[in-house]
């Protein structure tokens, strides 16, 4: 799987988990969440080459496509496959609210 | 939805579905599948501009990241998202088979 | 320079729907917690809801829970109100405003709002 | 819901005269949870004053806001002609948002 297990501890170019930290103030401009002050979020991304961890027939026949048409432009891309939610705390004024935000953390990826 | 309806209408630079045709033999050599001799299989592709068709809260989160971090290579990226299956006609020997294959057809795309 | 620009309002019987648009441009629309406030005719000023952009958490004012529905695209920096079943005392000019960045907070920029009439 | 009571309703001064405003909640809002916005005939309301005691910016230095727990107070040191309109208060403590009913500042 192309997770933090595998990506993290390899030098990867073709798609695969990569680390980003999220500061919600700082990068979203969020100042309604009061815990936690941000996240590894992490992301998807590299090449997809022939078969790499293509994950429908679709982008394995389109996979196949571009090994014998190097010319088209029609090739799989990397994109997250697994999500988690983020727990959060906010505050409805004077009152703490804690919600469940779900698919915020992408714990692995796959070429689509 | 980035669906056929939409996308082979408009010109559409952003992330949309691509008419894509696939001869069996001509572009993936196979000469196994007697019928059809190929299908229309599209495609995604085109940019992921803020927002665009995001499909998950991860990928809303980083497309609002990447507005405020322009600088920043963490975006979503144009995908599959509905697919059908491909009814074909194959012979075993002499004995002519029929079998759906699953996610051969992209329908519609999204940025994930 | 922020700017919120609302449209929709009309005249419109009792039982019947509405959608007004908030249209946001001059910042990074999703950083901020969006709400609705109207105002009756000669009255003064009553919150009607709030939705929290990108994640979609939204609350409303009793008077209206049921009956109303905020939302928003992201994408187009547009704020919408869907308004049905609609009652004689929903006719106010209606303001989306936007907050400091709490959720609940003091309101920092307001559209120049747009008048909502139900009558028969 | 937090009832904001303000007072007085109407308030006759002249220009250059001292303006004193005030809003009383019917429960605790705390230090920092009140604000208060200036409406003009056929205008959107305008933040003035946010967490009780903060300046928005572009406000003039005239308007300042005091006050904690269920006492506040807006005051403005020298009335300007501008400045005659109707002030609301307003609670985020507590959900819902709830406003006052509004004092109007006349030109007496």
């Known amino acids: 799987a192309l997770d933090a297990a595998y990506c993290f501890r390899n030098v990867q170019d073709n798609c695969c988990l990569r680390p980003l930290y999220i500061d919600f103030k700082r990068d979203l401009g969020w100042k309604w969440i009061h815990e936690p002050k941000g996240y590894n979020a992490n992301f998807c991304a590299g090449a997809c080459p022939y078969l790499w961890s293509s994950d429908t027939q679709h982008s394995r026949v389109l996979s196949l496509y571009n090994t014998i048409n190097p010319e088209a432009s029609a090739s799989p891309c990397c994109v997250s496959q697994d999500l988690e939610p983020l727990t959060i705390l906010y505050y409805i004024g004077k009152t703490p609210k804690i919600e469940q935000l779900s698919n915020m953390i992408v714990k692995s990826c796959k070429c689509s | 939805a980035l669906d056929a309806a939409y996308c082979f209408r408009n010109v559409q630079d952003n992330c949309c579905l691509r008419p894509l045709y696939i001869d069996f033999k001509r572009d993936l050599g196979w000469k196994w599948i007697h019928e059809p001799k190929g299908y229309n299989a599209n495609f995604c592709a085109g940019a992921c501009p803020y927002l665009w068709s995001s499909d998950t809260q991860h990928s809303r989160v980083l497309s609002l990241y990447n507005t405020i971090n322009p600088e920043a290579s963490a975006s979503p990226c144009c995908v599959s998202q509905d697919l059908e299956p491909l009814t074909i006609l194959y012979y075993i020997g002499k004995t002519p088979k029929i079998e759906q294959l699953s996610n051969m057809i992209v329908k519609s795309c999204k940025c994930s | 320079d922020v700017q919120l620009v609302e449209s929709g309002g009309d005249l419109v019987k009792p039982g019947g729907s509405l959608r007004l648009t908030c249209v946001a441009s001059?910042?990074?629309?999703?950083?901020?917690?969006m709400h609705w406030v109207r105002q009756a005719p000669g009255k003064g000023l009553q919150w009607v809801a709030y939705?929290?952009?990108?994640?979609?958490?939204?609350y409303y004012a009793d008077s209206v829970k049921g009956r109303f529905t905020i939302s928003i695209d992201n994408s187009k920096n547009t704020l919408y109100l869907q308004m049905n079943s609609l009652k004689t005392e929903d006719t106010a000019t209606y303001y989306c405003?936007?907050?400091?960045?709490?959720?609940?907070?003091?309101?920092?920029?307001w559209g120049q709002g747009t008048l909502v009439t139900v009558s028969s | 819901e937090t009832v904001l009571t303000q007072s007085p309703g109407t308030l006759s001064l002249s220009p250059g005269e001292r303006a004193t405003l005030s809003c009383r909640a019917s429960?605790?809002?705390?230090?920092?949870?009140l604000a208060w916005y200036q409406q003009k005939p056929g205008q959107a309301p305008r933040l003035l004053i946010y967490?009780?005691?903060s300046r928005a910016p572009g406000v003039p230095a005239r308007f300042s806001g005091s006050g904690s727990g269920t006492d506040f107070t807006l005051t403005i040191s020298s009335l300007e002609p501008e400045d005659f309109a109707v002030y609301y208060c307003?609670?985020?403590?507590?959900?819902?948002?709830?406003f006052g009913q509004g004092t109007k500042l006349e030109i007496k």
């Open positions: 405003a936007r907050t400091l960045g709490l959720v609940l907070d003091a309101m920092d920029y």
């Open positions: 001059g910042y990074t629309f999703s950083s901020n917690v």
């Open positions: 939705v929290i952009p990108i994640v979609d958490i939204a």
């Open positions: 429960q605790s809002l705390g230090s920092s949870y």
């Open positions: 967490g009780a005691s």
């Open positions: 307003q609670q985020y403590a507590d959900s819902p948002i709830t």
